[in-house]
Amino acid sequence: KEITNALETWGALGQDINLDIPSFQMSDDIDDIKWEKTSDKKKIAQFRKEKETFKEKDTYKLFKNGTLKIKHLKTDDQDIYKVSIYDTKGKNVLEKIFDLKIQERVSKPKISWTCINTTLTCEVMNGTDPELNLYQDGKHLKLSQRVITHKWTTSLSAKFKCTAGNKVSKESSVEPVSCPEKGLD
C-alpha cells in the first residue's frame, strides 16, 4: 500500500537530491518532522521544536521547511523514504512517502560511420537504462537502448543527431555526415 501511494522521485548517482514535501508549510504548530528509510525502519533525520536537529549521518541535511537533502547519492540510497509530521498536541498532520530511484547519468553519445559499409552507429557508453534516439535532418529515424545502427543505400549528405537520455540526464551529439556515391572513408 505504501509503495502505491509513493511519490516516484529520481536522483542521479553522485549528485545531491532534495525530497520536498508537497503542500506543506512550516508553522508554529509543527513540533516534530521525522524522516525514515523504510527498508531498515531507521530514523535518518528529525526536527523537533526547541531541540537539536537529528541526522543519522552527514550525508543528510534537514531544512527548516521539512525538506530532506541527501548528498552525493549512492546506489544504496535507493529506497522508500517516509516523512511523518506531528503537531504540538501529538497529532499526525501529514505523512508522505517517496520512492527514490537512482540512475547513473548518461554519457555523451558517440556517433561513428563508414561510407564503405554505408553504416552509421550511435552508441552510449555509460548510464542506467539509457534511451537512444537517432535523427536525420530533424526527422526521427530510430529508438534503441545502448546502440543504434543505421544503414543507407543511396549517396548521403545529412546532419545526424543522436540523443541519449534517462530519468536524470540527457546528452546529445550532432555530426554532419557526407558520403559520396561510391563511398570512401
Epitope: 511523518s84 506531528y86 501529538g90
Partner: antibody, heavy 117, light 112 residues
Framework: EVQLVESGGGLVQPGASLKLSCVAS????????MSWVRQTPGKPMEWIGH????????NYAPSLKNRFTISRDNAKTTLYLQMSNVRSEDSATYYC??????????WGQGTLVTVSS | DVVLTQTPVAQPVTLGDQASISCRSS???????????LEWFLQKPGQSPQLLIY???NRFSGVPDRFIGSGSGSDFTLKISRVEPEDWGVYYC?????????FGAGTKLELK
C-alpha cells in the same frame, strides 16, 4: 517488534491510590507520545489521557484530570498512571498505548483494576 | 464531549461476504489543520484492541486491503470487502480531533 506490558493492577479499596506501570520495548520510547485507555464491560472505552515524548506536556479527559496523573521515565522506557482516591467506577482493564501514526497505534495486553471494599 | 454512534450494534455476516459498519459523530471531526482524526479498531475476543485505520482511510501497517475506511465530516464507514474468520470481534470507531478523545460503543461482527 513493539511490546507494551502493563502491571500494577489488582484489588484496591475505594479511596486508596494505585500506580500502574507500562514497560515499553521494540521501539525508541523517547520518540513517542503515549496514552492510557480504560475499558469497562458494557461501557464505551474511555481515553484517560496522553503524555508527550519528553514528558513536558500531558492532557487528560476532564472527568479524570484531578485524580489521575500520567508520567514517564524515558531512561527506564516506562509509562506510569497514578490513580488517587479510586472509586468503584474506576474498575476496568487499563491499557497503555503508543501513539503515531494514530492516537493509539499499539496496545499493551492490559492490567485489571478492581475497586471494592 | 463528542458522541460517536455506531450502527449496527451487531452485524451478522457470512464468511466471504461484505460487512459495513457506520460511525456518526455528534459534530464534525475536521480539525483546524484540515485533517480528520477518525480511527477504527478491532478487538478480537480475549485480546487488546488493534488499530486498523487512521485518519479516516489510511490502513495501518500490516492491515489487509479488504479493510476500507471512508467518510468525511461527521459520517464514516468501515467496510470489510470479504469477511474472513480472523475478522470476528468488536469494531470501535474513535475520534482524536476534539478533547477529550472518545470511542464509539462498538459493533460486534458475528457469524450469521
Amino acid at each position: 517488534e513493539v511490546q507494551l506490558v502493563e502491571s500494577g493492577g489488582g484489588l484496591v479499596q475505594p479511596g486508596a491510590s494505585l500506580k500502574l506501570s507500562c514497560v515499553a520495548s521494540g521501539f525508541t520510547f523517547s520518540d513517542y507520545w503515549m496514552s492510557w485507555v480504560r475499558q469497562t464491560p458494557g461501557k464505551p472505552m474511555e481515553w484517560i489521557g496522553h503524555i508527550k515524548y519528553d514528558g513536558s506536556y500531558t492532557n487528560y479527559a476532564p472527568s479524570l484530570k484531578n485524580r489521575f496523573t500520567i508520567s514517564r521515565d524515558n531512561a527506564k522506557t516506562t509509562l506510569y498512571l497514578q490513580m488517587s482516591n479510586v472509586r468503584s467506577e474506576d474498575s476496568a482493564t487499563y491499557y497503555c498505548a503508543r501513539e503515531a501514526p494514530g492516537a493509539a497505534s499499539y496496545w499493551g495486553q492490559g492490567t485489571l483494576v478492581t475497586v471494592s471494599s | 464531549d463528542v458522541v460517536l454512534t455506531q450502527t449496527p450494534v451487531a452485524q451478522p455476516v457470512t464468511l466471504g461476504d461484505q460487512a459495513s459498519i457506520s460511525c456518526r459523530s455528534s459534530q464534525s471531526l475536521v480539525h483546524s489543520n484540515g485533517n480528520t482524526y477518525l480511527e477504527w479498531f478491532l478487538q478480537k475476543p480475549g485480546q487488546s484492541p488493534q488499530l486498523l485505520i487512521y485518519k479516516v482511510s489510511n490502513r495501518f501497517s500490516g492491515v489487509p486491503d479488504r479493510f476500507i475506511g471512508s467518510g468525511s465530516g461527521s459520517d464514516f464507514t468501515l467496510k470489510i470487502s470479504r469477511v474472513e474468520p480472523e475478522d470476528w470481534g468488536v469494531y470501535y470507531c474513535f475520534q482524536g480531533t476534539h478533547d477529550p478523545y472518545t470511542f464509539g460503543a462498538g459493533t460486534k461482527l458475528e457469524l450469521k
